[in-house]
């Protein structure tokens, strides 16, 4: 039997193609630096195929190596704005379970208004990823300026 | 039958491995903010496997979720140059069919000379991606400084 | 037979899922602009599945199109620091064999302290990738700030 046919007969989930792309929902209360995400076709071009959202944070459902990517743009921002405020930093990390807590990716907005990066990292079922924005600038909610996603790459 | 053998017997296209990496050909006339791309082994390390170029714009041939990535560097640029001009912004979006027109990814060069980002997005057969560079600074045509690509990730 | 089962019976290498994510080990001696990388689970979240390290440089073991990505952050850096020094530039390229030597990706730190980018490029078995950091600023060795990786995408 041709692989292409076999591929159609199996649910995609069994091929390990977990993937998610999220858009910003809101920021947390003052002492909570986390960004809260949302996803789904009703919201536009965001989606979750495999991973899930748990109170606005992304939870992994399949062990493997993932490509994690993020872009965050600060609202009403120019290089002048950025320089007028204390350094704003974005960190993506595993925030639960606590035993696996670690920072995976960190960037500062120096005199810029956007950060964007990506990396490969092993993640395990149940890992929850948090994106912490420290600083006092509000991020843009435009879906083409601020987004966060993961793509399963291999076991 | 071993999967590795089956894989060799099937055309790659049937596995859905559409991928393209393009280099800058030229900018548009004054009122046209689009960048015009080119690709192919004769040009260096750029290529199109599945997607096609339509008058310098990238047209998708297979439905699916794609990783879209781009880097654009401004020519003869320093942070001083960048700050002396009106904000230069790069936007990647679906420009046709008009019914699906949307901005997918947007970044500004604040006091920097390079932007680079990537995102996951659903694309459909026939979608044409345009990359609009607004501002009065010319982009570099160096193939290691300015490039644009897509990679099919899953159905 | 189900593909999911077939997948488990074959070594992953036969599926062409070569992937590596590296962390910075050290910089070279004064006249050597190369960054020297390290990887492996004992070091944290870095790994090599397929590619190998040759004296701190990444050597490819399988022909194909790869997604190459990198992030480099300068140590003890602010936008003031960055602007006070001669331009610092990062270039990723094939450095051996000499006949295939080429720059694949290049970025400058203008008034920023981090660069991050990614691109698709064809690589061949035996290609060694070098990451050259020119300038007089030391890169951060924090594993969430400086990393370099490749992912096999298709033949």
């Amino acid at each position: 039997q041709r692989f292409a046919q076999a591929q159609q007969q199996l649910p995609l989930e069994s091929l390990g193609w977990d993937v998610a792309e999220l858009q910003l929902n809101h920021t947390g209360p003052q002492q909570d630096p986390r960004l809260y995400w949302q996803g789904g076709p009703a919201l536009g071009r965001s989606f979750l195929h495999g991973p899930e959202l748990d109170k606005g944070q992304l939870r992994i459902h399949r062990d493997g190596i993932y490509m994690v990517h993020i872009q965050v743009t600060l609202a009403i921002c120019s290089s002048t704005t950025a320089s007028r405020h204390h350094p704003t930093t974005l960190a993506v990390g595993i925030c639960s379970p606590a035993s696996r807590s670690i920072s995976l990716l960190r960037l500062s907005f120096h005199q810029g208004c956007t950060i964007a990066s990506q990396r490969l990292t092993p993640l395990a079922r149940g890992d929850t990823l948090c994106t912490n924005l420290t600083g006092t600038l509000l991020p843009s909610r435009n879906t083409d300026e601020t987004f966060f996603g993961v793509q399963w790459v291999r076991p | 039958q071993r999967f590795a053998q089956a894989q060799q017997q099937l055309p790659l296209e049937s596995l859905g491995w559409d991928v393209a990496e393009l280099q800058l050909n030229h900018t548009g006339p004054q009122q046209d903010p689009r960048l015009y791309w080119q690709g192919g082994p004769a040009l260096g390390r750029s290529f199109l496997h599945g997607p096609e170029l339509d008058k310098g714009q990238l047209r998708i041939h297979r439905d699916g979720i794609y990783m879209v990535h781009i880097q654009v560097t401004l020519a003869i640029c320093s942070s001083t140059t960048a700050s002396r001009h009106h904000p230069t912004t790069l936007a990647v979006g679906i420009c046709s069919p008009a019914s699906r027109s949307i901005s997918l990814l947007r970044l500004s060069f604040h006091q920097g000379c390079t932007i680079a980002s990537q995102r996951l997005t659903p694309l459909a057969r026939g979608d044409t991606l345009c990359t609009n560079l607004t501002g009065t600074l010319l982009p570099s045509r160096n193939t290691d400084e300015t490039f644009f690509g897509v990679q099919w990730v899953r159905p | 037979q189900r593909f999911a089962q077939a997948q488990q019976q074959l070594p992953l290498e036969s599926l062409g899922w070569d992937v590596a994510e590296l962390q910075l080990n050290h910089t070279g001696p004064q006249q050597d602009p190369r960054l020297y990388w390290q990887g492996g689970p004992a070091l944290g979240r870095s790994f090599l599945h397929g590619p190998e390290l040759d004296k701190g440089q990444l050597r490819i073991h399988r022909d194909g199109i790869y997604m190459v990505h990198i992030q480099v952050t300068l140590a003890i850096c602010s936008s003031t620091t960055a602007s006070r020094h001669h331009p610092t530039t990062l270039a990723v390229g094939i450095c051996s064999p000499a006949s295939r030597s080429i720059s694949l990706l290049r970025l400058s730190f203008h008034q920023g302290c981090t660069i991050a980018s990614q691109r698709l490029t064809p690589l061949a078995r035996g290609d060694t990738l070098c990451t050259n950091l020119t300038g007089t600023l030391l890169p951060s060795r924090n594993t969430d700030e400086t990393f370099f990786g490749v992912q096999w995408v298709r033949p």
Epitope: L24, T27, Q30, T73, L74, A75, I76, C77, T81, S83, R84, H85, H86, T136, L137, L138, P139, S140, R141, N142, T143, E145, T146 | - | -
Partner: antibody, heavy 120, light 111 residues
Framework: QVQLQQSGPGLVQPSQSLSITCTVS????????VHWVRQSPGKGLEWLGV???????DYNAAFISRLSISKDNSKSQVFFKMNSLQSDDIAIYYC??????????????WGQGTSVTVSS | DIVLTQSPASLAVSLGQRATISCRAS??????????MHWYQQKPGQPPKLLIY???NLESGVPARFSGSGSGTDFTLNIHPVEEEDAATYYC?????????FGAGTKLELK
């Protein structure tokens, strides 16, 4: 709790300077910005300027030549000085805290106001 | 500078009824996925008090009878049901760019 307490003279002679001190409590000037706004019957509420948490200032272009805002983080004090006062500067002058997000540029807590009269 | 035009200049509303105040900006105050418009209440002898930020977000401690809506250039503050303590002057303020500007105010009186 958050408070902004203003102190300064209510009467200024024409062409002289107005100086107001805004002493804050319940929050840190290293985290929050402070705006200055005035209110007069003729012109309503007018934004004058702001001092950001970093100490950098932005002024309304209409007042930039005669306005100066500074601060002392350790004393939790913000200093407002406007030169060359004339009769159309008669107003109530307020200091007000910017909310946590610096680019929100609203005012969530206000001082009690300093009523300023210009007269010889 | 962005000019904010409030209407009406004054209105009288009975207890328990709805009060609607409008604010129109001379250009859009929307950017970055937010509407940078805020609403304040001011009573005689007091400084203004923030009620609503980013067009529709209720400031902490403000009663739920206050609500804000709108986007682009047209914004509305609603009070329902109006209570006796709501007699005051209401101002809109934008923060899309510097300088920040305020509307001229709407005086709400009780019938």
């Amino acid at each position: 709790q958050v408070q902004l307490q203003q102190s300064g003279p209510g009467l200024v002679q024409p062409s002289q300077s107005l100086s107001i001190t805004c002493t804050v409590s319940g929050f840190s000037l290293t985290t929050y910005a402070v705006h200055w706004v005035r209110q007069s019957p003729g012109k309503g509420l007018e934004w004058l300027g702001v001092i950001w948490s970093t100490g950098i200032t932005d002024y309304n272009a209409a007042f930039i030549s005669r306005l100066s805002i500074s601060k002392d983080n350790s004393k939790s004090q913000v200093f407002f000085k406007m030169n060359s006062l004339q009769s159309d500067d008669i107003a109530i002058y307020y200091c007000a805290r910017n909310p946590y997000y610096g680019n929100l540029n609203a005012m969530d807590y206000w001082g009690q106001g300093t009523s300023v009269t210009v007269s010889s | 500078d962005i000019v904010l035009t409030q209407s009406p200049a004054s209105l009288a509303v009975s207890l328990g009824q709805r009060a609607t105040i409008s604010c129109r900006a001379s250009k859009s105050v929307d950017t970055s996925g937010y509407s940078f418009m805020h609403w304040y209440q001011q009573k005689p002898g007091q400084p203004p008090k923030l009620l609503i930020y980013l067009a529709s977000n209720l400031e902490s401690g403000v009663p739920a009878r206050f609500s804000g809506s709108g986007s682009g250039t047209d914004f509305t503050l609603n009070i329902h049901p109006v209570e006796e303590e709501d007699a005051a002057t209401y101002y809109c303020q934008h923060s899309r760019e510097l300088p920040l500007t305020f509307g001229a105010g709407t005086k709400l009186e009780l019938k």
